[in-house]
């Protein structure tokens, strides 16, 4: 079994490799000096159906790199970076983890485009393993929350409640949703 | 940090066959693949071959190409290492090692298992 | 296979100098080169990837340069524990070892 010719790239070059190229071979993209990968860099031959070779994703691309691009901090509701920091620019890659409970979507890892948006694929989603969900938490009188997305939460998730100046938060600050699909306390007060 | 823990060190006969276990603990390990490298007494690293758990897939170095088989237990996270037709030459520290998901280089390094080979 | 090849075999460097190895790959590999420390009786320790980034926790003493066919792994000021036997690894083409470079005390 056998991968055909991997895909070509413009302004970049593909690492060597022999051919007929075996089901493991792994082939690596990277770009001409002035210009930025977008995209994971390594293919991988792979079987699907153990008859006939085909690699395991696209391709990267090359972009002209653009000193002027930067993008925005990327959020994965249920998630958290384990690589990359800001300032993002063009060519900077993120990569995500799913929080304990959360499984995820889509492809852990995106670039900062010459169009300053992430990609080449959308941001990854992490989803709750367990079907539970946690009401929608009230707002407070004189506070306020935030939560990491709007609406019913899945379990793992928080809200963080806050007080206007001039008021005192009484209660707990941070909630948790249960897996039970409960929270962790009732909400607090915000009293003067 | 993922760590790798090897079984003990053997001592075969010339014509047998070993088999090391590698357990991996921390990561995914469907994430990530292993290698199998050996270090002869004084000697440099050689690579024999390595394994995409989630695939199944292995691949060997032309020296060891029908002489070593690698596999992995998704179930138990444990890469195996079997070296056939052994030989006094054989004899060397066998290291598992790990490579995030096909980066090519090692992360993490079991701590080597001493395959000794004599009559 | 793709042979790499270290220089010198033996470094001698006295402590708070700066040690510079060499590897030199048989064809072009891009950038595709790591380097390795071993102390005895130990495992390999992960410094260098993609010929220049430094592994996680690698002190800044630690740096690598180079792409195509020559690589050089520098080391600032030489402290005590740095004394141990280094090896470049190319993942080019499959994966394949320099011999090696012991940097040993002057």
């Known amino acids: 079994i056998s991968c055909g010719s991997p895909p070509p790239i413009l302004n970049g070059r593909i690492s060597y490799y022999s051919t007929p190229i075996a089901v493991g071979t792994v082939i690596r993209y990277s770009c001409s000096g002035t210009f930025r990968l977008i995209g994971e860099k390594s293919l991988l031959c792979i079987t699907k159906d153990k008859v006939d070779g085909t690699w395991d994703k696209p391709a990267p691309k090359c972009e002209y790199f653009n000193k002027y691009s930067s993008c925005p901090e990327p959020i994965v509701p249920g998630g958290y970076k384990i690589r990359g920091s800001t300032p993002y620019r063009h060519g900077d890659s993120v990569t995500f983890a799913c929080k304990t409970n959360f499984s995820m979507n889509g492809n852990k890892s995106v670039w900062c485009q010459a169009n300053n948006m992430w990609g080449p694929t959308r941001l990854p989603t992490c989803v709750s393993v367990f079907p539970l969900e946690c009401p929608a938490l009230p707002m407070i009188h004189n506070g306020h929350h935030t939560s990491e997305n709007v609406g019913s939460i899945a379990p793992g998730l928080s809200v963080t409640y806050s007080c206007e100046s001039g008021y005192l938060l009484v209660g707990e600050k941070i909630i948790n949703c249960l897996s039970s699909g409960k929270w962790s306390a009732v909400p607090p007060t915000c009293e003067e | 940090q993922v760590q790798l823990v090897q079984s003990g060190a053997e001592v075969k006969k010339p014509g047998s066959s070993v088999k090391v276990s590698c357990k991996a603990s921390?990561?995914?390990?469907?994430?990530?693949?292993i290698s199998w490298v050996r270090q002869a007494p004084g000697q440099g690293l050689e690579w024999m071959g390595r394994i995409i758990p989630i695939l199944g897939i292995a691949n060997y170095a032309q020296k060891f190409q029908g002489r070593v088989t690698i596999t992995a237990d998704k179930s138990t996270s444990t890469a195996y290492m079997e070296l056939s037709s052994l030989r006094s030459e054989d004899t060397a520290v066998y290291y598992c090692?790990?490579?995030?998901?096909?980066?090519?280089?090692?992360?993490?390094w079991g701590q080597g298992t001493l395959v000794t080979v004599s009559s | 296979e793709i042979v790499m090849t270290q220089s010198p075999a033996t470094l001698s460097v006295s402590p708070g100098e700066r040690a510079t190895l060499s590897c030199r790959a048989g064809?072009?590999?891009?950038?595709?080169l790591a380097w390795y420390q071993q102390k005895p009786g130990q495992a390999p320790r992960l410094l260098i990837y993609?010929?220049?980034t430094r592994a996680t926790g690698i002190p800044a003493r630690f740096s690598g340069s180079g792409s195509g066919t020559e690589f050089t792994l520098t080391i600032s000021s030489l402290q005590s524990e740095d004394f141990a036997v280094y090896y470049c690894q190319q993942y080019e083409y499959w994966y394949s070892f320099g011999q090696g470079t012991k940097l040993e005390i002057k």
């Open positions: 090692a790990r490579e995030e998901d096909i980066s090519g280089y090692y992360q993490d």
């Open positions: 993609d010929a220049s």
């Open positions: 921390g990561g995914t390990f469907s994430s990530y693949a």
């Open positions: 064809q072009s590999i891009s950038h595709y």
